[in-house]
């Protein structure tokens, strides 16, 4: 019969013959022959292969470097690489999460619209009229101005986006 020019999925062509690829978590030891199957071996400690493959060496698991703010989210297996994430208060600088940066804080006059996660930074928004933030924070939202009326008080000093209103007693009519 004619030697194949293409092979099925999870196979590869070598010496005019279709051989089975090694499954994830295993590396190639020897190609198949007319009489023998492909020989594969499991990846060892600290190694992985995450696809059907014909690699003769497994890849090393990545290291979550605490000096870069990283910690282990999930350790590697023979079929998966280690997944790193950032320490509390930090987030990844890229999708691959190779290093971390400190979450940004929202300055006075701005509040947190969305709290940062291990993979996304803080999203800030300006405090609209009627709201304020007087701190630099990665957690605080804009707070509504105090309602003087509900306390039977009057506004003595108007609020801004950075300060609350100042309430005071109502002027009493003298008898």
């Amino acid at each position: 019969p004619e030697p194949p020019t293409a092979c099925r999925e999870k196979q590869y062509l070598i010496n005019s013959q279709c051989c089975s690829l090694c499954q994830p978590g295993q590396k190639l030891v020897s190609d198949c022959t007319e009489f023998t199957e492909t020989e594969c071996l499991p990846c060892g400690e600290s190694e992985f292969l995450d696809t059907w493959n014909r690699e003769t060496h497994c890849h090393q698991h990545k290291y979550c470097d605490p000096n870069l703010g990283l910690r282990v989210q999930q350790k590697g297996t023979s079929e998966t690489d280690t997944i790193c994430t950032c320490e509390e208060g930090w987030h990844c600088t890229s999708e691959a999460c190779e290093s971390c940066v400190l979450h940004r804080s929202c300055s006075p006059g701005f509040g947190v619209k969305q709290i940062a996660t291990g993979v996304s930074d803080t999203i800030c928004e300006p405090c609209p009229v009627g709201f304020f933030s007087n701190v630099s924070s990665a957690f605080e939202k804009c707070h509504p101005w105090t309602s003087c009326e509900t306390k039977d008080l009057v506004v003595q000093q108007a609020g801004t986006n950075k300060t609350d209103v100042v309430c005071g007693p109502q002027d009493r009519l003298r008898a």
């Epitope: 499991p42 060892g44 600290s46 190694e47 060496h57 497994c58 979550c64 282990v72 350790k75 297996t77």
Partner: antibody, heavy 120, light 106 residues
Framework: QIQLLQSGAELVKPGASVKLSCTAS????????MHWVKQRPEQGLEWIGR????????KSDPKFQGKATITSDTSSNTAYLQLSSLTSEDTAVYYC?????????????WGQGTLVTVSS | QIVLTQSPAIMSASPGEKVTITCSAS?????MHWFQQKPGTSPKIWIY???NLASGVPARFSGSGSGTSYSLTISRMEAEDAATYYC?????????FGAGTKLELK
């Protein structure tokens, strides 16, 4: 900082069993593979096996199957090595050594070792 | 299982002398780790993934190799280097250690 505290020395009779412990601090054992290594007096190092505390799966050297059982308890952050049907050949220091994924290199930390003496 | 053969089993070296310890694997391995052990103490990782020095290991140490042949070299022997060195492969289960090389100061 990271530390591994192993249980104290054991003097046991032939045929008996013993269970050694290795308690980790400074990291979560679920982020490591916990290995056990044997060293007989004046001899070299022998790998017994390891456990993945995240799922309880173990791998071990076939020559220790039936002799050594590795378990772990994530609530106490502890790995265990149980040795059964003890003989004089089992007299050795037993070390635990995690392959911890928050460390730059594997086997960066070792316990102080537990001496098991098998004698009647 | 992969057998690691270390040579020599025992050797002595004078201060300043170059020392090479070899580790031969019965089958090809992806990498080799080296451990140092002194009497009465736990082993210490010394060289990892063939050629990387662990923290605190002097730069006079180096590691190299591939396939079935690996080595640890000390460019200039010092008294504190006297110890037993073990190679270990982790690329195939079961993990295996070499029998060790005892390095003494002459």
């Amino acid at each position: 900082q990271i530390q591994l505290l192993q249980s104290g020395a054991e003097l046991v009779k032939p045929g008996a069993s013993v269970k050694l412990s290795c308690t980790a601090s400074g990291f979560n054992i679920k982020d490591a593979y916990m290995h056990w290594v044997k060293q007989r007096p004046e001899q070299g190092l022998e790998w017994i096996g390891r456990i993945d505390p995240a799922n309880g799966y173990t791998k071990s050297d076939p020559k220790f199957q039936g002799k050594a059982t590795i378990t772990s308890d994530t609530s106490s952050n502890t790995a265990y090595l149980q040795l059964s049907s003890l003989t004089s050949e089992d007299t050795a220091v037993y070390y635990c050594a995690p392959n911890y994924y928050g460390s730059r290199y594997p086997f960066a930390y070792w316990g102080q070792g537990t001496l098991v003496t098998v004698s009647s | 299982q992969i057998v690691l053969t270390q040579s020599p089993a025992i050797m002595s070296a004078s201060p300043g002398e170059k020392v090479t310890i070899t580790c031969s694997a019965s089958s090809s391995v992806s990498y080799m780790h080296w451990f140092q052990q002194k009497p009465g103490t736990s082993p210490k990782i010394w060289i990892y993934f063939t050629s990387n020095l662990a923290s605190g290991v002097p730069a006079r140490f180096s590691g190299s190799g591939s396939g079935t042949s690996y080595s640890l070299t000390i460019s200039r022997m010092e008294a504190e280097d006297a110890a037993t060195y073990y190679c270990q492969q982790g690329s195939t289960y079961p993990l295996t250690f070499g029998a060790g090389t005892k390095l003494e100061l002459k």
